[in-house]
């Protein structure tokens, strides 16, 4: 989290972000919340990153002011319009790349000062894992895919029975580069294993860590995954 | 409500110009994309540009460039199409939509009823 | 430029079955594809944006699948109304590209 005042001027405003990461080929949010004000038409917000001519975004009276816009994020951007009032400044990016990363400031105008603060964007890809039994394997396997990570991830197993256990002797991880020649599809294997077990795949990158678990007994198959985004800190 | 019309049918000779309207009700005209789509009679959809009324900037279909014109006049909420050195295989029906996300180019959510325009000596 | 490449080019189907339309991207790798009907005459009609988002008042009989550059459109239980053509539109780019289109015909 990074919270941010205004230096210059008689007041000083409250700018909040948050850190963040995008997932290209999709939307990202660019979080920033500020001091509300009561009329919008006094709200001035500019979206600026380093590195960058143009404005990422400007929204003043009441409505997007493009004429500053750098080319590169063209027809890329929106603020939520109707959220704006009550402090929301949070930026919405269409099609993120793994050039969208940088630093980004939101800076903030209204009738009781000026306030920013910076915002570091990370891009890369991350998707949830899906682990299944592998049942065309010889003996008992486990097959854990994930289908698009960027930078290249490290890949863990574990286990609730054997906690501790080091799996890397009965498992063999592959990265299969897929068709935009970025993004890559991750493929686990784990053999040998138990039934009555719990077995977890973890997915990490700097971006991002997700586990997917299984539960296999005699009688059934249990799944689930979650995805955590890393360093999502406040400014 | 948003509400897109559209001119009415036009019929060109080969070699000629044609503009086509699209007037905008119902939302902030500056603050929206419009795109502008063409269908041949019995074919399928073609994108051929969109612009951003409040700035004027455009996105053209590389088919198109050099041929295709557009414009939005703010004043009165319309955005044209202009296509000039027409042929026959430009007879089709030009559809006016406006793109969802605000400034952000989205989908085609809003489309005007179409204006068709037949090129025939 | 990114082309689109929808098929089949038309499908004959019976009401209540399950009908499955494809839309392949020549390139990328993004969410940003839309579904539209079109019936003889009018103007198409957004289904589905962002891959599986559901326009507001669309039937939950339609629905939208995808990732990477394969996507589909799953008419769960055809009704007589939705027989139509419909269009894949990918809109991620700079640059538009709509598929050529699936008719949708009565068996």
């Known amino acids: 989290l990074i919270i941010g005042f205004g230096i210059s001027g008689r007041h000083s405003i409250t700018v909040t972000t948050v850190a963040s990461a995008g997932n290209i080929g999709e939307d990202g949010i660019l979080s920033c919340t500020f001091e509300p004000d009561i009329k919008l038409s006094d709200i001035v917000i500019q979206w600026l990153k380093e590195g960058v001519l143009g404005l990422v975004h400007e929204f003043k009276e009441g409505k997007d002011e493009l004429s500053e816009q750098d080319e590169m994020f063209r027809g890329r951007t929106a603020v939520f319009a109707d959220q704006v009032i009550v402090g929301n400044a949070s930026l919405r990016l269409k099609n993120v790349q793994l050039t969208d990363a940088g630093t980004y400031k939101c800076y903030i105008i209204t009738s009781k000062g000026k306030g920013n603060a910076n915002l570091e964007y990370k891009t890369g890809a991350f998707s949830m894992p899906e682990v299944n039994v592998d049942y065309n394997a010889s003996s008992e396997t486990l097959r854990c895919e994930a289908p698009r990570w960027f930078p290249q991830p490290t890949v863990v197993w574990a286990s609730q029975v054997d906690q501790g256990a080091n799996f890397s002797e009965v498992s063999n991880t592959s990265f299969e580069l897929n068709s935009e020649n970025v993004t890559m599809k991750v493929v686990s294997v784990l053999y040998n294993v138990t039934i009555n077990n719990t077995y977890s795949c973890m997915i990490e990158n700097d971006i991002a860590k997700a586990t997917g678990d299984i539960k296999v007994t005699e009688s059934e198959i249990k799944r689930r995954s979650h995805l955590q985004l890393l360093n999502s800190k406040a400014s | 409500e948003v509400q897109l019309v559209q001119s009415g049918a036009e019929v060109k000779k080969p070699g000629a110009s044609v503009k086509v309207s699209c007037k905008a009700s119902?939302?902030?005209?500056?603050?929206?994309?419009i795109g502008w789509v063409r269908q041949a009679p019995g074919q399928g959809l073609e994108w051929i540009g969109d612009i951003y009324p409040g700035g004027g900037y455009t996105n053209y279909n590389e088919k198109f460039k050099g041929r295709a014109t557009l414009t939005a006049d703010t004043s009165t909420s319309t955005a044209y199409l202009e296509l000039s050195s027409l042929r026959s295989e430009d007879t089709a029906v030009y559809y006016c939509a406006r793109l969802d996300g605000s400034s952000y180019r989205g989908a085609m959510d809003s489309w005007g009823q179409g204006t068709l325009v037949t090129v025939s000596s | 430029d990114i082309q689109m490449t929808q098929s089949p080019s038309s499908l004959s189907a019976s009401v209540g079955d399950r009908v499955t339309i494809t839309c392949k991207a020549s390139?990328?790798?993004?969410?940003?594809v839309a579904w539209y009907q079109q019936k003889p005459g009018k103007a198409p009609k957004l289904l589905i944006h962002y891959t599986s988002t559901l326009q507001p008042g669309v039937p939950s009989r339609f629905s939208g699948s995808g990732s990477g550059t394969d996507f589909t459109l799953t008419i769960s239980s055809l009704q007589p109304e939705d027989f139509a053509t419909y269009y894949c539109l990918q809109y991620g780019n700079l640059l538009y590209a709509f598929g050529q289109g699936t008719k949708v015909e009565i068996k």
């Open positions: 119902g939302y902030t005209f500056t603050s929206y994309w």
């Open positions: 390139q990328g790798f993004n969410k940003y």
